[in-house]
Interface confidence: low
Amino acid sequence: KSSNEATNITPKHNMKAFLDELKAENIKKFLYNFTQIPHLAGTEQNFQLAKQIQSQWKEFGLDSVELAHYDVLLSYPNKTHPNYISIINEDGNEIFNTSLFEPPPPGYENVSDIVPPFSAFSPQGMPEGDLVYVNYARTEDFFKLERDMKINCSGKIVIARYGKVFRGNKVKNAQLAGAKGVILYSDPADYFAPGVKSYPDGWNLPGGGVQRGNILNLNGAGDPLTPGYPANEYAYRRGIAEAVGLPSIPVHPIGYYDAQKLLEKMGGSAPPDSSWRGSLKVPYNVGPGFTGNFSTQKVKMHIHSTNEVTRIYNVIGTLRGAVEPDRYVILGGHRDSWVFGGIDPQSGAAVVHEIVRSFGTLKKEGWRPRRTILFASWDAEEFGLLGSTEWAEENSRLLQERGVAYINADSSIEGNYTLRVDCTPLMYSLVHNLTKELKSPDEGFEGKSLYESWTKKSPSPEFSGMPRISKLGSGNDFEVFFQRLGIASGRARYTKNWETNKFSGYPLYHSVYETYELVEKFYDPMFKYHLTVAQVRGGMVFELANSIVLPFDCRDYAVVLRKYADKIYSISMKHPQEMKTYSVSFDSLFSAVKNFTEIASKFSERLQDFDKSNPIVLRMMNDQLMFLERAFIDPLGLPDRPFYRHVIYAPSSHNKYAGESFPGIYDALFDIESKVDPSKAWGEVKRQIYVAAFTVQAAAETLSEVA
């Protein structure tokens, strides 16, 4: 029997029943419950929360809820030897030391086990030397320093402001530039919005607030000691020297009060332009070293953190499908936090909890989804997406054969302005259709759809009358599902107005001040934005699990493939002479995209017309849709990044958070004019065009009539 026959409820009614069951008040209650103490990965507190969630998901009505544990490499500060940075004079005396902890927020003064700010996986070390200010430590910032300003970072300690790109990329860039240490700091230009007070009186970062975070360059590997395989009881572990992605130089984060003390003494070169100046009352001189009277003073880092193999726990809940139990729709978000996790991750975990409760309520009334829904509470996301990656490595054979879709559920909010969605093009129409059915929570849009407010506030930069939907990058738990396994993925959250708020992320990100009160007082007092995000995430899961024909539109992939081909071609065309010299042609790629477009169009026509009452044909058509994302996977992976296997999308090599299209070609073309061997470099461009063209053509053929 189909799930609808079993309950005699129409699909539309089911969706409405599911959405109506979601309550803002419950999300608020769950958020409060999840944020009263820290839940750092690998700690007893986070294990206890895993068991609590397991118990509650069972009560909510899931068929089964299991803990899946792994022993992975984590990183912690040394409790007896705190990390700090000092300014030392010529005698080696410490004349200034940075703070050892953040001043606790009101009401949390007596909470124990607040981990002090640190850069996870920093090696130990006590380097000392002159300081060089490197702006955001992006690739282009080091180009500016080394190529234009002729400043050598070799043997220097660099200080970089947080923002714009993933912190791990900053550290990698500093290492490549020869630096011997990295200081990361939050500049008010990026983490203090004008006209807003600092916490606890507003949502801005106080001077003593510091952003924690890992500084790995894992490129999708998961546990650094067991790349490609689960960190289970019989795992073979690499030695620390062979571990994947660990930084080789000490790194430490500080707040802007401490940064002021380091930056105010800077001498050497003036900043190259205004884009290198933040908002502190300092000259933003690049260095190297301190100015005039202070030129004999140096900076010294004292880093004593340790890397330890530690047990982590995922919670995996199952709601078995009535018709296609061997097809999995996954909703997953992490549970571990740096401290209280008021936004990251618990604003997401609370939403997942309410979605599980709503699905459970329907199940108790006799309903089942058509396909199986898996719910996941991931551990150790903050340490490199470890929980989700290890679970996916352990279950990769099942997932690649049965995985329909993965919906991510980290922070539900990073602002309260409008919706933000990143997803596979296969989900564009699903997201558009769903948001047209949901009410906007925004002021001034009463009675209007979410689609309307979203489109108005965040228009597509390319297409009129459409909202912006971004490419998936990384930095969150969808990575292994999308970039490695090729499972259609998406994420949604409420975000800020990027036009008026130029700061990076939200100001209190990964600080001790990310509390329940931050959300309840300043971001979403009525929890209406949380509810909307629950409706979007939950609605997507519902449709993916319950629609008879999978709600994927392959024609949208055709459109973006053409756009991405145009884009990469225009990048290449900045080198017309070399393209001529080395006979570089994009004809094969454009031809493949054209074929894909035609085949996708014909497939969509067949999808309208086929006999949906024939279960074999229905399954066949759905399998073609499910496996389309899989068809973009290259088993050999991208050059030097074997776990990034998607040929159309990968995290940018310069910023893990950002998605890049045709990444193989893009990376081959990047800075190609500086390559020593142009013939070899352009040969690699040609090879990458070949790989991309083949992959697009092969993917197109999966949509052809099967016989």
């Epitope: 297409f463 009129s464 145009d566």
Partner: antibody, heavy 116, light 107 residues
Amino acid sequence: EVKLEESGGGLVQPGGSMKLSCVASGFTFSNYWMNWVRQSPEKGLEWVAEIRSQSNNFATHYAESVKGRVIISRDDSKSSVYLQMNNLRAEDTGIYYCTRRWNNFWGQGTTLTVSS
Amino acid sequence: NIVMTQFPKSMSISVGERVTLTCKASENVGTYVSWYQQKPEQSPKMLIYGASNRFTGVPDRFTGSGSATDFILTISSVQTEDLVDYYCGQSYTFPYTFGGGTKLEMK
């Protein structure tokens, strides 16, 4: 109310130059990409050029038929967009409209005639 | 360049009639098609964007549909003021291109 007002059209000889202007009001001009579109009985509606906003580095795009002869520019402080046309040809004759991003709002047009 | 072909070039119709205008793209443009109405001595006005979304202030007798290469503008019950020129245009890729237009005339 969104308003776009073009000016600067007129009669010009082949090989001559002309600068068209468009003043915008009723919206935050600096946030929007702007286009010039022309219309003639022979060619119908024809997109000419686009200039993007500061956040897009004022990127410009041109139709092949005008590339190298036309420059689109903008002055956000004056809420104005311009079309400098050089080496004019008879086929450039038509009504020139200034349009807001996606051609969702159009001005009333200014007529350019290229004839000896 | 993507060619947008409109047909018929002109149509004679009576007030109250339902009318369907067609626009065909030479290659897939997704749903990035707009429809414009142009009255004599006036500039074009947007009617439909994103193939099927009615622009602000446009009467609901105007409906757009289609995707990929085939697009339709339907006027459910033609009024006298609707007997003017209609153009489709694509904003999927450069250069942006327009159809040659369809002229609605009184029967």
